[in-house]
Interface confidence: medium
Amino acid sequence: AHYNTEILKSIDNEWRKTQCMPREVSIDVGKEFGVATNTFFKPPCVSVYRCGGCCNSEGLQCMNTSTSYLSKTLFEITVPLSQGPKPVTISFANHTSCRCMSKLDVYRQVHSIIRR
Amino acid sequence: AHYNTEILKSIDNEWRKTQCMPREVSIDVGKEFGVATNTFFKPPCVSVYRCGGCCNSEGLQCMNTSTSYLSKTLFEITVPLSQGPKPVTISFANHTSCRCMSKLDVYRQVHSIIRR
């Protein structure tokens, strides 16, 4: 079959843009750390890089292969307000490289971490 | 309370980076359109803009207020392979503006669309 080169180029571009790689995302601080329901953060979210995008096959999953940690200062507010907003410094995982891994490998990796 | 102004600025910057706005995301074509399980797309994902980020309050949700549609050409593969990959042009929703809306308003909006 003969395909229009423009179509091939645009498809190739789509592959590139959707590949598994670190992407800037907004994460909810409270949900990330499972904090008490009477504790709030301002801002409620922080911007970090996490692995995202798509893999070429159903059996693969986009996973981080290396991680750095970013310290960010936020205001913590505890209700009832015994004091004003308190600046707190929290460390967030920041994915620096990613790879499409088989879901079985991911399962093994996660379970080996849990077992430690 | 005395606050370090550098911290105040970095906190404000975090608000900025995590605000509700159109963000480039990778979406799974098959999942987006709920296609038959024997149909695959190459690439399996496309890059579009969708509303994302955080709102200042629990009761608010980041929602699109305007949408454009992008046409993208992909290869469609149907199993068993009766023919080679077939180029198909599909239209994808691309969010162009967003707003933090109350979850009640979002519910009403979604239900008014369903009712039509």
Epitope: P43 | A1, H2, Y3, N4, T5, E6, L8, K9, I11, D12, N13, W15, R16
Partner: antibody, heavy 122, light 107 residues
Framework: EVQLVESGGGLVQPGGSLRLSCAAS????????IHWVRQAPGKGLEWVAV????????YYADSVKGRFTISADTSKNTAYLQMNSLRAEDTAVYYC???????????????WGQGTLVTVSS | DIQMTQSPSSLSASVGDRVTITCRAS??????VAWYQQKPGKAPKLLIY???FLYSGVPSRFSGSGSGTDFTLTISSLQPEDFATYYC?????????FGQGTKVEIK
């Protein structure tokens, strides 16, 4: 061209109220913090309050906390200073000033309005 | 609150003179110091930010230095338009505080 124009000053009795406005133009209003700084006749400069029009974050000098409220209307590119329970020592020229840039590490006021005089006297 | 103490409170100088104004913070303020020039009946103008960075459009005869608690504003060669009052300001913590000012007069 960046411009800040204050208005709303005048003579008011002790215990009275006044609302100052600061109309901003020539820049993206939500990209900079907006401060109010005052100067009593023949005296030095005193910082009063600040707002981030972007996030709505506000901070005040202890001398005005609970009496003054800073706010911003992003649709009008205008910051306000609502002054209640005014005292004789609040008499001053009130300037609104723009913070140099949200990306700079610290506050520094790069553009100032012409000032508006507030006189608190019976 | 952090106190900013300027010295001298006034000085007399001639055109072409090198002028130095100092500012001392009551505690460490890193490099979070700005300098302003104010003329009678006018709003202040930013000269220096973050202790040593010359603000855009400000003549290069103005310079700033220092970190921690001791800061200096220098005018290398005083010009007629430089006769004014100069203020230092710390913005390391809230509230930002100003020095009491240094009036530079014609000798």
């Amino acid at each position: 061209e960046v411009q800040l124009v204050e208005s709303g000053g005048g003579l008011v009795q002790p215990g009275g109220s006044l609302r100052l406005s600061c109309a901003a133009s020539g820049f993206t209003f939500t990209d900079n913090w907006i401060h109010w700084v005052r100067q009593a006749p023949g005296k030095g400069l005193e910082w009063v309050a600040v707002i981030s029009p972007y996030s709505g974050a506000t901070y005040y000098a202890d001398s005005v906390k609970g009496r003054f409220t800073i706010s911003a209307d992003t649709s009008k590119n205008t910051a306000y200073l609502q002054m209640n329970s005014l005292r004789a020592e609040d008499t001053a020229v009130y300037y609104c000033a723009r913070d140099a840039d949200y990306k700079y590490a610290f506050w520094a006021f790069d553009y100032w309005g012409q000032g508006t005089l507030v006189t608190v006297s019976s | 609150d952090i106190q900013m103490t300027q010295s001298p409170s006034s000085l007399s100088a001639s055109v072409g003179d090198r002028v130095t104004i100092t500012c001392r913070a009551s505690q460490d303020v890193s490099t979070a110091v700005a300098w302003y020039q104010q003329k009678p009946g006018k709003a202040p103008k930013l000269l220096i930010y973050s202790a040593s960075f010359l603000y855009s459009g400000v003549p290069s005869r103005f310079s700033g230095s220092g970190s921690g608690t001791d800061f200096t504003l220098t005018i290398s060669s005083l010009q007629p338009e430089d006769f004014a009052t100069y203020y230092c300001q710390q913005s390391y913590t809230t509230p930002p505080t100003f020095g009491q000012g240094t009036k530079v007069e014609i000798k």
